[in-house]
C-alpha cells in the first residue's frame, strides 16, 4: 500500500517533468548534479538528489509562475513510508556531488528516466514471466 | 506535440509474419516506453506489449511466443513483428506512447490488418 | 489476468447532461487506472490516469475517482465533442488490460 502510494506520485511527477521540459527556456542554465545508470537498491539516494537540486526559474516572461508552481511539486517529499529503507542505502550509493552534472534539459531527461525505471520496476515486481529482455 | 504514424501491409496470409512499424514525429523515441495495441473488429482494446528505449520488453503473455518489438532510435521508429498469424488477428493495430509507464499519452490513428488468403 | 468490466457498454444522454461510467477491476489495483476516448478512425485520447489525474491539456469537465476495485468516470456537463467510446485500463501488473468500451451517444 505505501509502496503504491510511492508510485502513484512518481507517475504524477513524469507529468510535472514533461511539463518542466516545456519550459527549459525559461529555467537558470546552471549545471546540476543528475544521476544516470543508476545502480538498483541506490533509486531513492539518486531520487533525493534530484530532488535536492536548485532548479531555478530564470524570473523572465510569464511563464515564473508555472515555472515555480511546478518545481516545488517536484520537491514535495514523497510520503514517509519506506524512508528507513531508503536512509540504509544511502549509506553505500554515491553522494549527489558525485554524480556527473547537466544543464536543465538532460537534468529533466534523467528525472523522468528515473522515474520511469522505479515505477516499471513496481510493476514487473507484480508480475511473473513479463519481463523479455 | 508528439506523433505517431503506423505503416505497414493491409493485408497478411494465415501462417505468415505481421510486420508493421511505427514512425515517431514531434518528439525522441530514445526516452519514454513505445508500445503496440490491437482491436479486433467489433471487440474491446488488447495490450500487445511495449518497449522502453533501452530496448527491454513486456508482451502479453496471450501473445508472447509470437511477438516481436524493436526499436531503431537513428530511424525514430519501432516496430511489431507477429508470426503464425490467422484471422483472430485481424484487427486495427494502434501504436502508442507511454511516458509514464502504466497508460499511453499518444496514439497513432491505427491501421487495419486483415489475415486472409 | 485482471479483467476489467465497464457499464453500462452503451449511454444515450443529450448537451449539457452529467455522465458517469463505471469500472470494476476483477481484483483490487490500488488506483492504477487510466480513461481514454476514442472516436471513429481517430487516435484514442488519454484523459485521466492514475484513477484522478487529469491529463494535460483535458477539459476540467472531466474527473475521475475510485481505488481499489471500483472506479468512475464523470463528464460533468456533456459538450458535442464528447460523443464517443471510452475505455478503462488498468496498469497493477502485466498484461496491461482494457475494459470492453461504453459509448456515449447522443439521445
Known amino acids: 500500500q505505501g509502496q503504491d502510494r510511492h508510485m502513484i506520485r512518481m507517475r504524477q511527477l513524469i507529468d510535472i517533468v514533461d511539463q518542466l521540459k516545456n519550459y527549459v527556456n525559461d529555467l537558470v542554465p546552471e549545471f546540476l548534479p543528475a544521476p544516470e545508470d543508476v545502480e538498483t537498491n541506490c533509486e531513492w539516494s539518486a531520487f533525493s538528489c534530484f530532488q535536492k537540486a536548485q532548479l531555478k526559474s530564470a524570473n523572465t516572461g510569464n511563464n515564473e509562475r508555472i515555472i515555480n508552481v511546478s518545481i516545488k511539486k517536484l520537491k514535495r517529499k514523497p510520503p514517509s513510508t519506506n524512508a528507513g529503507r531508503r536512509q540504509k542505502h544511502r549509506l553505500t550509493c554515491p553522494s549527489c556531488d558525485s554524480y556527473e552534472k547537466k544543464p536543465p534539459k538532460e537534468f529533466l531527461e534523467r528525472f523522468k528516466s528515473l522515474l520511469q525505471k522505479m515505477i516499471h520496476q513496481h510493476l514487473s515486481s507484480r508480475t511473473h514471466g513479463s519481463e523479455d529482455s | 506535440q508528439v506523433q505517431l504514424q503506423e505503416s505497414g501491409p493491409g493485408l497478411v496470409k494465415p501462417s505468415e509474419t505481421l510486420s508493421l512499424t511505427c514512425t515517431v514525429s514531434?518528439?525522441?523515441?530514445?526516452?519514454?516506453?513505445w508500445g503496440w495495441i490491437r482491436q479486433p473488429p467489433g471487440k474491446g482494446l488488447e495490450w500487445i506489449g511495449y518497449?522502453?528505449?533501452?530496448?527491454?520488453?513486456n508482451y502479453n503473455p496471450s501473445l508472447k511466443r509470437r511477438v516481436t518489438i524493436s526499436v531503431d532510435t537513428s530511424r525514430n521508429q519501432f516496430s511489431l513483428k507477429l508470426s503464425s498469424v490467422t484471422a483472430a488477428d485481424t484487427a486495427v493495430y494502434y501504436c502508442?506512447?507511454?511516458?509514464?509507464?502504466?497508460?499511453?499519452?499518444?496514439w497513432g490513428q491505427g491501421t487495419l490488418v486483415t489475415v486472409s488468403s | 489476468d485482471i479483467q476489467m468490466t465497464q457499464s453500462p457498454s452503451s449511454v444515450s444522454a443529450s448537451v449539457g447532461d452529467r455522465v458517469t461510467i463505471t469500472c470494476r477491476a476483477s481484483?483490487?489495483?490500488?488506483?492504477?487506472l487510466a480513461w481514454y476516448q476514442h472516436k471513429p478512425g481517430k487516435a484514442p485520447k488519454l484523459l485521466i490516469y492514475?484513477?484522478?489525474s487529469l491529463q494535460s491539456g483535458v477539459p476540467s469537465r472531466f474527473s475521475g475517482s475510485g481505488s481499489g476495485t471500483d472506479f468512475t468516470l464523470t463528464i460533468s456537463s456533456l459538450q458535442p465533442e464528447d460523443f464517443a467510446t471510452y475505455y478503462c485500463?488498468?496498469?497493477?501488473?502485466?498484461?496491461?488490460?482494457f475494459g470492453g468500451g461504453t459509448k456515449v451517444e447522443i439521445k
Open positions: 492514475v484513477a484522478s
Open positions: 514531434g518528439g525522441s523515441i530514445s526516452s519514454d516506453f
Open positions: 481484483q483490487g489495483i490500488s488506483s492504477w
Open positions: 485500463q488498468q496498469a497493477n501488473s502485466f498484461p496491461l488490460t
Open positions: 518497449i522502453s528505449s533501452s530496448g527491454s520488453t
Open positions: 502508442a506512447r507511454s511516458a509514464g509507464v502504466t497508460d499511453f499519452d499518444f
